[in-house]
């Protein structure tokens, strides 16, 4: 069920590091903040979820990366290229991106000064 | 094969200290966060005492904090509880296990489990 | 902490039959972070489902998992002898990651 862990290269990079983790929960936490009361999430029913949960996993994940700008933001981007598809519009998206900038706060993280979100093609 | 095997148990008097060891084989270890969790006899499962990959994040349960001490070594692929100050309530089962998680959908669970190492606290 | 509630403690019941086992949570519990494990006497754990509904590998699709909020619950659809044994679920979102107390499924 897990990975066959990994792309190839130096294991200290932070893309091998971002493909360790999981960033679901970072996922998860960040769209049941967006969304609130509305429908049902994918497979997981976020409506009547504490947020808690998935923040403290989330963290917990995050904080498995070197602690540097490149790499949380290499995170930061993937997370948004995962999600990017299931942003119904652009608002979604600004709102996404927003809550997705305030996570390393939240995880009292130190938050990458330049991340550029802009992924899939500019569609995100 | 994919196996963990515990280590360490036996009989300790009460106030005494006692070592458990998890020895993992048959997978990468590093990538994986891993747990202690007990089972008193006739009792049901407790969990203890988890670590994540790196070991910068570590939890405990309430009734050991600030008695147990988990630790891992990658390079050595085995896991550890340090347990000081044991009480008679400490008397279990002790089983190491894994954690993984579903890639596509993001779930935890503990898929592979020791047999277990018997801890006896008792004066 | 999250103190998770099963019910029955024993549940008797004939091969064949279906069983449904019930999980309560005091707080609510995200479906991604609850997990059923099988243990059979002398055995260690086995996993059985996680996510709340999916089951894990090579576990039979005469069980089956629902739920979420407060609320779960592990159905088995037609009990084979091997089925006889105590079922535990847990949630592994927030520290301190707690087992409920266990449902004991006995042959009647």
């Known amino acids: 069920m897990r990975r066959e862990r990994g792309r190839q290269g130096d294991s200290s990079s932070c893309e091998r590091q971002v493909d360790r983790v999981n960033l679901k929960p970072c996922e998860q936490h960040i769209m049941q903040r967006i969304m609130g009361e509305q429908e049902q999430y994918d497979s997981y029913d976020i409506r009547s979820t504490r947020s808690s949960d998935q923040q403290q996993r989330c963290c917990d994940e995050l904080n498995e990366m070197e602690n540097t700008q490149r790499c949380m933001c290499e995170a930061l981007q993937q997370i948004m290229e995962n999600q990017c598809d299931r942003l119904q519009d652009r608002q979604m998206v600004q709102q996404f991106k927003r809550e997705l900038m305030n996570l390393p706060q939240q995880c009292n993280f130190r938050a990458p000064q330049r991340c550029d979100l802009d992924v899939s093609g500019g569609r995100c | 094969e994919v196996q963990l095997v515990e280590s360490g148990g036996g009989l300790v008097k009460p106030g005494g200290s006692l070592r458990l060891s998890c020895a993992a084989s048959?997978?990468?270890?590093?990538?994986?966060?891993m747990n202690w969790v007990r089972q008193a006899p006739g009792k049901g499962l407790e969990w203890v005492s988890s670590?994540?990959?790196?070991?910068?994040?570590?939890y405990y349960a309430d009734s050991v904090k600030g008695r147990f001490t988990i630790s891992r070594d990658n390079a050595k692929n085995s896991l550890h509880l340090q347990m000081n100050s044991l009480r008679d309530a400490d008397t279990a089962v002790y089983y190491c296990?894994?954690?993984?998680?579903?890639?596509?959908?993001?779930?935890?669970?503990?898929?592979?489990w020791g047999n277990g190492t018997t801890v006896i606290v008792s004066s | 902490e999250i103190v998770l509630t099963q019910s029955p403690g024993t549940l008797s019941l004939s091969p064949g039959e279906r069983a449904t086992l019930s999980c309560r949570a005091s707080?609510?519990?995200?479906?991604?972070?609850l997990v059923w494990y099988q243990q059979k006497p002398g055995q260690a754990p086995r996993l059985l489902m996680y996510?709340?509904?999916t089951r894990a590998t090579d576990i039979p699709d005469r069980f089956s998992g629902s739920g979420s909020g407060t609320d779960f619950t592990l159905t088995i659809s037609r009990l084979e002898p091997e089925d006889f044994a105590v079922y535990y679920c847990?949630?592994?979102?927030?520290?301190?990651?707690?087992f409920g107390q266990g449902t004991k499924l006995e042959i009647k």
């Open positions: 296990a894994r954690e993984d998680f579903d890639v596509s959908t993001g779930p935890y669970y503990m898929d592979v």
């Open positions: 048959g997978f990468i270890f590093s990538d994986y966060n």
């Open positions: 670590i994540t990959r790196s070991s910068r994040t570590i």
């Open positions: 707080q609510s519990v995200s479906n991604m972070f």
């Open positions: 996510g709340a509904s």
């Open positions: 847990q949630q592994n979102g927030n520290s301190p990651y707690t």
